[in-house]
């Protein structure tokens, strides 16, 4: 159905291609987790990565970049 | 239960100016997405703009930028929409919407019950 | 500006049909997209949220379909209180822009 699993961790990269529906599970989740790309209007929301949607929840989350922490990529990893 | 209670109806002069309030009970008003959406007599649905969370500030459609400032008193829960440069187009019923969200403006979950606004000489 | 256009702008119906109302994005929304009813001197009231999700206390005659561009409000046994005008709305992008309406009178 064009949904793909992948780990929701901050690893640099957005679950699936561009637009497309995906999952994600952690070893503590039970259940599939499951995202979306964000609306446009979040376009500027992670302030140093990527953008996905939990469609459950109609909520926007972060992938950061390497270096960067926070619900919206907006802290810098000092230690990094 | 989320209550959004508007001021009543005004009838404004052409080029003036008018505020319309909208306060919420029931919820915590601060986390939660205003929008301002106004109905034409006889006519559709049409978003003005609204206070996006995420942001901690307000975002307008192009059509009424810079006539229309859109606030919010968390220490009253009200918002507020003012609409300047009245003209007898603007004549319409205002409504302040709640957006679903604590982060952007989704879907408008909870409505005011309107005001009319009549714009004549 | 995301353009909505929904059909038809009205139509008329009997107690117990299925209505099928039709919304269609000028670009693709996912599923970033809203259903409303609005009665006369009423604010709107919410039915569908994110294109296929039942609103909390909205009868289940009412469902939402589609993705993309393409969307459907179905109401699967129409009743007396149904008839109303049916607005969708779009959230991907600002401006949230509305269709025009389906206004939903009795044959």
């Known amino acids: 159905d064009g949904n793909t699993t992948r780990t929701p961790e901050t690893n640099g990269s957005l679950c699936g291609a561009p637009g497309e529906n995906c999952t994600g599970t952690t070893p503590r989740q039970k259940s599939k987790t499951h995202f979306s790309r964000c609306p446009k209007q979040y376009k500027h929301y992670c302030i140093h990565g990527r953008c996905r949607f939990v469609m459950d929840e109609q909520t926007p989350s972060c992938i950061c970049e390497k270096g960067y922490f926070g619900a919206r990529c907006e802290q810098v990893d000092l230690f990094y | 239960q989320v209550q959004l209670v508007q001021s009543g109806a005004e009838v404004k002069k052409p080029g003036s100016s008018v505020k319309v309030s909208c306060k919420a009970s029931?919820?915590?008003?601060?986390?939660?997405?205003i929008s301002w959406v106004r109905q034409a007599p006889g006519q559709g649905l049409e978003w003005m703009g609204g206070?996006?969370?995420?942001?901690?500030?307000?975002v307008y459609a192009q059509k009424f930028q810079g006539r229309v400032t859109i606030t919010a008193d968390e220490s009253t829960s009200t918002a507020y929409m003012e609409l300047s440069s009245l003209r007898s187009e603007d004549t319409a019923v205002y409504y302040c919407?709640?957006?679903?969200?604590?982060?952007?403006?989704?879907?408008?979950?909870?409505w005011g019950q309107g005001t009319l606004v009549t714009v004549s000489s | 500006d995301i353009q909505m256009t929904q059909s038809p702008s009205s139509l008329s119906a009997s107690v117990g049909d299925r209505v099928t109302i039709t919304c269609r994005a000028s670009q693709s929304i996912s599923n970033f997209l809203n259903w409303y009813q609005q009665k006369p001197g009423k604010a709107p009231k919410l039915l569908i949220y994110?294109?296929?999700n039942l609103q909390s206390g909205v009868p289940s005659r009412f469902s939402g379909s589609g993705s993309g561009t393409d969307f459907t409000l179905t109401i699967s046994s129409l009743q007396p209180e149904d008839f109303a005008t049916y607005y969708c709305?779009?959230?991907?992008?600002?401006?949230?822009?509305f269709g025009q309406g389906t206004k939903v009178e009795i044959k």
């Open positions: 029931g919820g915590t008003f601060s986390s939660y997405a």
């Open positions: 206070i996006v969370p995420w942001m901690g500030e307000a």
């Open positions: 994110a294109a296929s």
């Open positions: 709305q779009q959230y991907d992008d600002f401006p949230m822009t």
């Open positions: 919407a709640r957006s679903s969200s604590t982060y952007g403006i989704h879907a408008f979950d909870y």
